[in-house]
């Protein structure tokens, strides 16, 4: 349940099924408000935020980016197409995630519940999408050395990857939120 | 120039069925989930049904579940809706209507088709 | 089933603001029930104003604004004009179908 329904919400003979469009819609609305507060930290924190130097370390990443062939914007959407590239996104996001744990100070729940909700969504989404099979894991082996990979990182760099996944997921909810209003 | 045309409404007895037709042109119609929005004499709007943008989900109104199927053909660019056993209470004036992407774009309501269910 | 309510009637004086609100029988109206409002006159198709809380659609005046107020969607008209008289209906995405209230109809004085 995204923490942004309050109790009496819960209770409202309203209350929709997991795969609902408003929960699934609720739920990316949290994860992007938790998003928020961390970028406020990473942004008060060090000044990556206005950094031109993003390309160095974007080098050194591969995230998950909507593109035309994905079938998530306007022109050219493919429904199918679109919600398999956002599961898979969402499973290849989550090894960045795991990377922002122990990276926030005053914001480390907040972290973790930007990482649990993000499992939940993509529970959410596997209900939704329960007659799709083209959908692939994560391998874990690669995924534990990209972290290591990550982890060993000089610290300018570090602050930077954070900074990148921060916005670069953000980036990627807002456009699956967007599609997701057209399945 | 965006448009949708509603069509196949008239004069029948309860009971009957009838299918009615919206062709849109103007914009990508397999890019939008569209919708059925009815509104009896005198009355408020009241939504009926939407379809998936390639059809995959459908979605009722309790007061319809059952009764109604909702369709699209991408390829023709037409919505249908297929009422069976109809009722007085669903006389009214039938729009159909595409759910827009951003709030900038222009959303267009054709004139509607009127349904009459009448002994 | 949840009901979606708006006040029957409001009037506003030529030039003055009104505020329609838009709220659920049970539990408060977020941001992920996508408020929209439309404009109907007599004899006339709806209009729709605003898309997703406080997006205007493409056309609409900037005298009309939507926002989240409390636990309800609101309209508000800045400096009615009397062409604003009609009826206003606002929908709301429940769960995966959307629910229409039952309309205010505004009154434009003088």
């Known amino acids: 349940v995204p923490p942004g329904e309050d109790s009496k919400d819960v209770a409202a003979p309203h209350r929709q099924p997991l795969t609902s469009s408003e929960r699934i819609d609720k739920q990316i609305r949290y994860i992007l408000d938790g998003i928020s507060a961390l970028r406020k930290e990473t942004c008060n924190k060090s000044n990556m935020c206005e950094s031109s130097k993003e390309a160095l370390a974007e080098n050194n990443l591969n995230l998950p980016k909507m593109a035309e062939k994905d079938g998530c914007f306007q022109s050219g959407f493919n429904e199918e197409t679109c919600l398999v590239k956002i599961i898979t996104g969402l499973l290849e996001f989550e090894v960045y995630l795991e990377y922002l744990q122990n990276r926030f100070e005053s914001s480390e729940e907040q972290a973790r519940a930007v990482q649990m909700s993000t499992k939940v969504l993509i529970q959410f989404l596997q209900k939704k999408a329960k007659n799709l099979d083209a959908i692939t894991t994560p391998d874990p082996t690669t995924n534990a050395s990209l972290l290591t990979k990550l982890q060993a990182q000089n610290q300018w760099l570090q602050d930077m990857t954070t900074h990148l996944i921060l916005r670069s997921f953000k980036e990627f909810l807002q456009s699956s939120l967007r599609a997701l209003r057209q399945m | 120039q965006l448009q949708v045309v509603e069509s196949g409404g008239g004069l029948v007895q309860p009971g009957s069925s009838l299918r009615l037709s919206c062709g849109a042109s103007g914009f990508t119609f397999s890019s939008h989930r569209m919708y059925w929005v009815r509104q009896p004499p005198g009355k408020g709007l009241e939504w009926v049904s939407a379809i998936s943008s390639s059809g995959v989900s459908t979605y009722y109104a309790d007061s319809v579940k059952g009764r109604f199927t909702i369709s699209r053909d991408n390829a023709k660019n037409t919505v249908y809706l297929q009422m069976n056993s109809l009722k007085p209470e669903d006389t009214a004036l039938y729009y159909c209507?595409?759910?827009?992407?951003?709030?900038?774009?222009?959303?267009?309501w054709g004139q509607g088709t009127q349904v009459t269910v009448s002994s | 089933q949840t009901v979606v309510t708006q006040e029957p009637s409001l009037s506003v004086s030529p030039g003055g603001t009104v505020t329609l609100t838009c709220g659920l029988s049970?539990?408060?109206?977020?941001?992920?029930?996508?408020p929209g409002w439309f404009q109907q006159t007599p004899g006339q198709a709806p209009r729709a104003l605003i898309y997703s809380t406080n997006d205007r659609h493409s056309g609409v005046p900037s005298r009309f604004s939507g926002s989240i107020s409390g636990n309800k969607a609101a309209l508000t008209i800045t400096g009615a004009q009397p062409e604003d008289e009609a009826d206003y209906y606002c929908a709301l995405d429940i769960g995966d179908i959307t629910e229409f209230g039952g309309g205010t109809h505004l009154t434009v004085l003088g």
């Open positions: 049970s539990g408060s109206v977020t941001a992920s029930n996508y």
């Open positions: 209507k595409r759910r827009t992407w951003y709030g900038g774009e222009y959303d267009y």
